[in-house]
């Protein structure tokens, strides 16, 4: 009977081990070891035993001890199990962006490592174990699928191997891959909301607002706003899960016509777009022409209004007959027309919308000067010592200057409160004078003395 000790050995790869071979008889005819491993007999041995040192053990092996005793030949094997940690533990790259709500497949590759029976592969989120599997195959590949939520954004995923050699060598060997950070995103299926004018006038400023709710992470979202070939430069305001991009747009005559307004919100590797048609139009204000802006009373004045060829005009609220871009009327200027406004309103249909433009011109009518009985009475009779305010209003454009003088020497205080005295009595010559000429009117002041009452 041949014996071997130790019957089982676990050792690190490239390690050495001492193995004792012994025979059951006292004087074996032969005693030895058969192994492909480099071996060295450790002397001195005994009559019925030998000690060998096996070195550079690279893989599992079963060296065999044999003995030849008088009663027969026998052999015994020792089981050498080599252990080593994996040479490569690698988590497959994660997608640059992972949509929220979509399952994520984690894949880990393990190269090397033995004994495989004692090698476990774990997939981790941070330090939390998601899956634990045995390492099978070379390289071993372990996968697991996990649902992804918003709280996974920025989470670290890794792969860890455990070589558990307990209770043999009372050791647990761990190898961990480089962590991979997950970027999750949530872009709703609804397109952005785009608020913009449907029609925009050349050389005017319009405001475009593009907004979208339900974005995650909102700070990573990008917005693209463009009107035709013109890229807009929006100011972006971020909410909790929403964003609003506001841009000013000014269009030129070259862009006249129908243009596409595009708003795109990009998040992760996805884009949501909204398109809208904007009609760009040119519509100058109508022209109001007066044959002369300043005329003398009695002059005939032609008031003419002309607008865009496709517009319809109204002059002082009266539509052109027939409806069209021109309207005119004739008037004989009266003092009442002085300062009168002539307003032309033009209406143009653009993309089903009515747009309006107004222009106003004022007529100046030169008239007077005038001194009428109504505004400058020819006779006043006042009690002596009473308080009176002489009133005399001259009319005209330009506004006339007025003076009332008695005998060219005594002025009558027009519009001022006076105490009536005998000196005030008499006939005053009131003169109204402007660049258009001069009119005069006599005004008589009678003073009633108390003794005549």
């Amino acid at each position: 009977q041949t014996s071997v000790f130790p019957p089982e050995v676990i050792l690190p790869r490239g390690g050495s081990v001492k193995v004792n071979c012994s025979a059951s008889c006292d004087q074996p005819i032969s005693l030895g070891m058969e192994t492909p491993l480099p071996k060295k007999e450790i002397l001195p041995g005994g009559n019925n035993w030998k000690m060998y040192e096996l070195s550079n053990v690279q893989e599992d092996s079963q060296p065999m001890c044999y003995s030849n005793c008088p009663d027969g030949q026998s052999s015994a094997k020792t089981l050498l199990t080599v252990y080593w940690t994996p040479e490569r533990v690698e988590l497959a790259p994660l997608p640059p962006w992972q949509p929220v709500g979509k399952n994520l497949t984690l894949r880990c590759q393990v190269e090397g490592g033995a004994p495989r029976a004692n090698l476990t592969v774990m997939l981790l989120r941070g330090e939390k174990e998601l899956s634990r599997q045995s390492a099978v195959g070379e390289p071993a590949e372990v996968t697991t699928t996990v649902p992804v939520g918003r709280d996974d954004h920025g989470a670290n995923f890794s792969c860890r191997t455990e070589l558990d050699l307990r209770p043999y060598v009372l050791k647990l060997f761990e190898n961990t891959s480089a962590p991979h950070q997950l970027q999750t995103f949530d872009l709703p299926a609804t397109p952005p909301q785009l608020v913009s004018p449907q029609v925009l006038e050349v050389d005017t400023q319009g405001t475009v607002v593009c907004s979208l709710d339900g974005l995650f992470p909102v700070s990573e979202a990008q917005v693209s706003l463009a009107l035709g070939d013109q890229k807009l430069n929006p100011t972006i305001t971020y909410g909790n899960n929403s964003l609003s991009a506001k841009a000013s747009v000014k269009v030129t005559a070259e862009e006249e016509g129908t243009q596409q307004l595009l708003c795109g919100v990009m998040l992760g590797n996805q884009t949501q777009e909204t398109r809208q048609t904007v009609t760009i139009y040119s519509f100058p204000a109508p022209n109001v022409n007066l044959t002369k802006p300043e005329v003398s009373e009695g002059t005939e004045v032609i008031v003419e209004c002309e607008a865009h060829p496709r517009a319809k005009v109204m002059l002082n609220g009266v539509p052109a007959q027939p409806p069209g871009p021109r309207a005119q009327f004739l008037l004989k200027a009266t003092p009442e027309d002085n300062g009168r406004s002539f307003s032309c309103s033009a209406t143009l249909e653009v993309a089903g919308q009515l747009v309006h433009k107004n222009q106003t011109r004022e007529l100046r009518v030169l008239y007077g000067p005038r001194l009428d009985e109504k505004d400058c009475p020819g006779n006043w009779t006042w009690p002596e010592n009473s308080q009176q305010t002489p009133m005399c209003q001259a009319w005209g454009n330009p506004l006339p200057q007025l003076k009332c003088l008695k005998d060219g020497t005594f002025p009558l205080p027009i519009g001022q409160s006076v105490t009536v005295t005998r000196d005030l009595e008499g006939t005053y010559l009131c003169q109204a004078r402007s660049t258009r000429g001069e009119v005069t009117r006599e005004v008589t002041v009678n003073v009633l003395s108390p003794r005549y009452e």
Partner: antibody, heavy 117, light 110 residues
Amino acid sequence: QSVEESGGRLVTPGTPLTLTCTVSGFSLSSHAMGWVRQAPGKGLQYIGIIGSSGSTYYASWAKGRFTISKTSTTVDLRLTSPTTEDTATYFCVRDPYDSFGDAYRLWGPGTLVTVSS
Amino acid sequence: AYDMTQTPASVEVAVGGTVTIKCQASQSIYSYCSWYQQKPGQRPKFLIYDASKLASGVPSRFKGSGSGTEFTLTISGMQSDDAATYYCQQAYSSSNVDNAFGGGTEVVVK
């Protein structure tokens, strides 16, 4: 339109003197004419006025000492009995009471009267 | 009587400065107050009529105000050319008058 005074000269006290204001470019029937004097180194002193109707009005101190009269183109100021205190430059003024402004406030260059024995 | 009292009799003012001349009528002359500027050897120059209206060609630094019995002439941003004697005149009554003119204010520019 202009006004110009004449007749200023050296007179002995008590010798009556008439100053004449000749107007051109306007009618005296529609304008009042006044007389103002200024003694050497002194202020302006109002003497009197003749209205467009021909009525005359005098400063209280001037009554009896001066007489204002007019023809169609001239206005006269008569110093009835001059004294040395009447030595002054005498100005003729058109419309001193008109409130249309400086187009009517027309002053002559003045004429110097010297009363001395 | 409708007479005018003017103050001060003389005033000294620096170039760029402001001067205020006052006139008081013995009774209300409403707004009928005129102001004149006179330089030595020259006839009076008409400045202001109806208390506050500027005669044509008169710079806006001359300002008249007041009504009734109290009137003021203010000259701001004085220039050396403004050195003269200034007179107020009541232009309301041509009778019952002792003197229609104020006594005058000599303005000396430093």
